[in-house]
């Protein structure tokens, strides 16, 4: 199968990205343009303008200037000027940033709160199952199982720190050798990138904002694949993770430390026990075969029991079991012997939703999905919503200078590496990459930062969780602290190999192009985002994980062809685009295959078929949320509700329906400016529009 | 209160089978073991076995092995003794007891069932 | 088989005496042994097991004490009711064992 064309071109032409770019018109001379420098090379940029949009409100007939979709987009100050306030007017400002301020960080803590409370509703649907793919016995002479069974329990679980815990518990019982486990770090590694993936499928409303979130959250996916795809062999080959790792973790002279310092958990996680809480050891007890785990229930129930050793009655096998010949005996058909046991008193239930309700995990699962999903959705597009309002005019150009601008050379290269420190640090901060690239995930999508600066901030991040992994491994107890540092270190010791290849020469950050690429394919066909993330972290690792348990030939056998199906096709896209008159004339374009083998199109029209029928209900429910948000944030009467229904209502104005309303997050100030129609300052009027 | 009650007395041809019941109450039945003690006329006390009714598992001494058949009947909460191919040396008072959960001390005992064995 | 051997087996005793029944293994035992009770036509009852410890019911003069391989069962006032047959038990392995018993008579 060939591949996609659009990947082709990441950015040389955004014209064929913007959606309403049919007619250009001459370019305004007076209009200055933000370049945007980053630490990447420049990209060459087509400037043109779309048609303008009709309201019944108000007519804007300003001409807009589209640059390069990956430029990032001015966020213009629709608000009045300080000066031109009057006291009251100050005052209601001050008031309202400050309302802002604590919106924002309210729905920052529940958007954290709720990543916490997906990741244990994913444990609760996938955990024993998850926990389960450890207990396969091909883990230790096939790496590609141990990669992929790596990748599904992460996503099972939506949470690295679970599958290499359960790594480590089974190495420090023998049950994994480090060798065995070093590809399932790497997989959980890729698995981990999948939480800002499905963050950034919650801006899919607005078509670029949409391109550069889904970009920037990807950049995350292709580093940690690329670097497998190259390290994993070498592993395999050398195993100098393992030589490394181990020389460090021999020369130690081991004291146990303290316990990795909780640092965002002491603010969630009063919170989050209020919700559900988990049992975490249940995993760990399937995964080591254990089979009394698989009956019991992963919502934990009692959260104060008291553990009392004492001596019991035990019945015994045979003589060979009893702790002594005199403390052994029979009632007549059983051996019994006196053993110390340590028995557990349950003293206090927890204090959490589920705690009464009994409900099966999987029930439990469900619902917190739901509402995890829905809180998390919510919480994203307030703050979206809150940043959108507050980053305009000065405050934009302030902080998107202080984040994008290199330092002044020759420190320019240096600045990348600033920001991979930046990246580690508030990920060991908020104690969880997952958090931390959730977070940036928005910020790129609104186009705060770019994605050429996201990405040395994701593979800081990267480090980030291995350092704590690193702190965690270092507290933990005698019997497991050398496996769990070695595993630690494997982890570091691989992202930091992963940079070396894909940050340090420009050229190399390939991950950063396959990102944009894939950004504009999924700008331009938003279900394709869907389908990445079912193949890439469900259907791949799936189809490797059965090919690997029917065995070395089989998987070889597939493997095989598929891989050299992807090698030729690599080669012939990369000669079709670099030296095309090497190739006879059939080969030079994909045209000589079926439509629907080189462009997403025919499939697009497929799925609009199935999606069709529920676009118009889903849009009406949009514009009731839309009008209920507005009413809440004081909106203008007239916003166009919403940008979710934006496709749906071009398709209409193309048909001669009209539109109602301009864009949601236009503000009426701007459309009174159009026409020198501003109004003198007024006490109740917005700051900066919500 | 606890009650163990046995079957009557028996007079069995040497190389017959006889069958003995122990009938329990005010007690869990499938809980305790249930012992079979043998005591010839003027003799000491002799274990034949245990059966435990829960599962209807069972151990015997080694003496009476083949000879004695331990069953258990949990809807009538009553244990069986089976003696077979019996010669006179098997002329006894034969007692069922109540092991003691966890280990082998009887702490409640039947009457004893009068086996004698004679042509 | 674990073998137990009473001593003495018989004693004569009055009203008021102290008695002491010893009974000894041929291996240790631990603390797995019981004392019974039988009087003539009677049932056995159990008196002491775990080597000391008073069955329910029991009244407080009788007493045991030993572990290993010598157990002793211990009657400190004789009450005219006390005049029976003693055995001792061993629970430490299969099969159950008893003493071949002490028959305690009126002086």
């Known amino acids: 199968m060939a591949p996609w064309p659009e990947l082709g071109d990441a950015q040389p032409n955004p014209s064929k990205y913007l959606e309403g770019a049919t007619s250009q018109q001459p370019i305004t001379p007076d209009k200055s343009k933000e370049t945007n420098k980053t630490d990447n090379t420049e990209v060459p940029v087509t400037k043109f303008e779309l048609l303008p949009t009709y309201s019944t409100a108000t007519l804007i007939e300003e001409p807009t200037e589209v640059d390069d979709p990956w430029n990032l987009p001015t966020l213009q100050d629709s608000g009045i000027k300080w000066s031109e306030r009057d006291a009251k007017g100050k005052i209601l400002c001050v008031f309202q940033g400050i309302g802002r301020l604590i919106l924002l960080l309210g729905f920052l803590y529940f958007f954290v709160c709720s990543l916490d409370v997906l990741s244990s509703a994913f444990q609760l649907v996938g955990g024993k199952m998850a926990g389960q793919f450890f207990s396969n016995s091909s883990i230790m002479s096939n790496p590609l199982l141990g990669l992929v069974i790596g990748v599904l329990v992460t996503v099972f679980v939506q949470s690295s720190s679970t599958s290499t815990s359960i790594v480590v518990s089974m190495v420090a019982s023998s049950l994994l050798t480090v060798r065995a486990a070093i590809p399932i770090i790497m997989g959980a590694n890729i698995g981990t990138s999948i939480t800002n993936t499905i963050v950034a499928l919650m801006q899919v409303g607005d078509r670029s904002e949409f391109r550069r979130a889904f970009a920037g959250a990807t950049v995350h996916d292709f580093f940690n694949w690329l670097s497998v795809l190259v390290l994993l062999p070498v592993e395999v080959a050398t195993h100098y993770l393992e030589v490394v790792t181990q020389l460090i973790v021999e020369s130690f002279h081991f004291k146990n430390g303290e316990d990795a310092p909780d640092l965002l958990k002491v603010i969630t996680k009063p919170f989050t026990k209020l919700i559900v809480q988990l049992d975490k050891k249940v995993i760990s007890q399937i995964a080591m075969n254990d089979e009394t785990a698989k009956n019991k229930s992963l919502v934990k129930i009692w959260c104060k029991t008291f553990t009392n050793m004492t001596q019991m009655n035990v019945t015994v096998p045979s003589m060979a079991n009893c702790t002594s010949p005199s403390l052994c005996w029979t009632d007549g058909i059983q051996i019994w012997t006196m053993k110390n046991v340590t028995y557990k008193e349950n003293i206090a239930k927890c204090q959490h939703i589920f705690v009464n309700f009994h409900l099966p995990d999987l029930a439990v699962g469900i619902i917190l999905l739901i509402i995890s999903l829905l809180v998390l959705c919510g919480c994203l597009i307030m703050i979206v919503k809150i940043l959108g309002s507050v980053l305009k005019g000065q405050v934009a150009t302030v902080i998107k200078k202080t984040i994008n601008t290199d330092f002044p050379f020759p420190f320019a290269w240096l600045t990348g590496y600033l920001a991979i420190l930046v990246g580690a640090g508030m990920t060991f901060i908020v104690q969880s990459s997952s958090v931390f690239t959730s977070a940036l995930t928005p910020l790129i999508g609104i186009g705060v930062i770019t994605i050429e600066r996201a990405y040395p901030l994701t593979l800081g991040s990267n480090i980030g969780t291995t350092t704590t992994a690193i702190l965690a491994a270092l507290a933990s107890p005698g019997n497991t602290l050398r496996s769990s540092l070695q595993i630690a270190l494997c982890h570091f010791f691989f992202n930091i190999s992963g940079i070396l290849l894909w940050y340090p020469i420009p050229f190399t950050r390939l991950p950063i192009r396959m990102a944009k690429g894939l950004g504009n394919i999924s700008a331009k066909y938003r279900w394709f985002a869907i389908f990445y993330l079912i193949i890439f972290f469900f259907l791949i690792p799936l189809t490797v994980f059965g090919l690997s348990l029917a065995g070395w030939p089989v998987l070889v056998g597939v493997g095989v062809p598929v891989v050299f199906i992807i090698i030729l096709v690599l080669c012939l896209r990369l000669l079709q685009s670099r030296c095309p008159r090497v190739l006879p004339k059939k080969l030079q374009n994909w045209n000589f295959l079926p439509l629907c083998m080189h462009s997403l199109k025919p499939w697009d029209a497929v799925i609009s078929k199935f999606t069709g029928p529920f676009q118009m209900p889903c849009c009406c429910c949009c514009r009731v949320c839309c009008r209920v948000c507005c009413l809440l944030c004081g909106c203008p009467k007239c916003c166009r509700c919403s940008k979710c229904c934006q496709d749906l209502e071009e398709g209409q104005e193309a048909q001669g329906v009209p539109v109602k309303a301009p864009e949601t997050f236009d503000n009426i100030t701007i459309s009174r400016e159009a026409q020198g129609e501003v109004r003198a300052p007024d006490s109740k009027t917005e700051c900066t529009a919500l | 209160q606890v009650q163990l009650v046995q079957s009557g007395a028996e007079v069995v041809k040497p190389g017959a089978s006889v069958k003995m019941s122990c009938k329990t109450s005010g007690y869990t039945f499938t809980t305790n073991n249930m012992h079979w003690v043998k005591q010839a006329p003027g003799q000491g006390l002799e274990w034949i076995g245990a059966i435990y009714p829960g599962s209807g598992a069972t151990a015997y001494n080694q003496k009476f092995k083949g000879r004695a058949t331990l069953t258990a009947d949990k809807s009538t909460s009553t244990a069986y003794m089976e003696l077979s191919s019996l010669r006179s040396e098997a002329t006894a008072v034969y007692y069922c007891a109540r092991g003691m959960y966890g280990h082998g001390a009887m702490d409640y005992w039947g009457q004893g069932t009068s086996v004698t064995v004679s042509s | 088989d674990i073998q137990l051997t009473q001593s003495p087996s018989f004693l004569s005793a009055s009203v008021g005496d102290r008695v002491t029944i010893t009974c000894k293994a041929s291996?240790?035992?631990?603390?797995?042994v019981a004392w019974y009770q039988q009087k003539p036509g009677k049932a056995p009852k159990l008196l002491i097991y775990?080597?000391?410890t008073r069955h329910s019911g029991v009244p407080s003069r009788f007493s045991g004490s030993g572990s290993g391989t010598e157990f002793t069962l211990t009657i400190s006032s004789l009450q005219p009711e006390d005049f029976a047959t003693y055995y001792c038990q061993q629970y430490s392995s299969n099969p159950l064992t008893f003493g071949q018993g002490t028959k305690l008579e009126i002086k």
């Open positions: 291996q240790d035992v631990g603390t797995a």
């Open positions: 775990w080597a000391t």
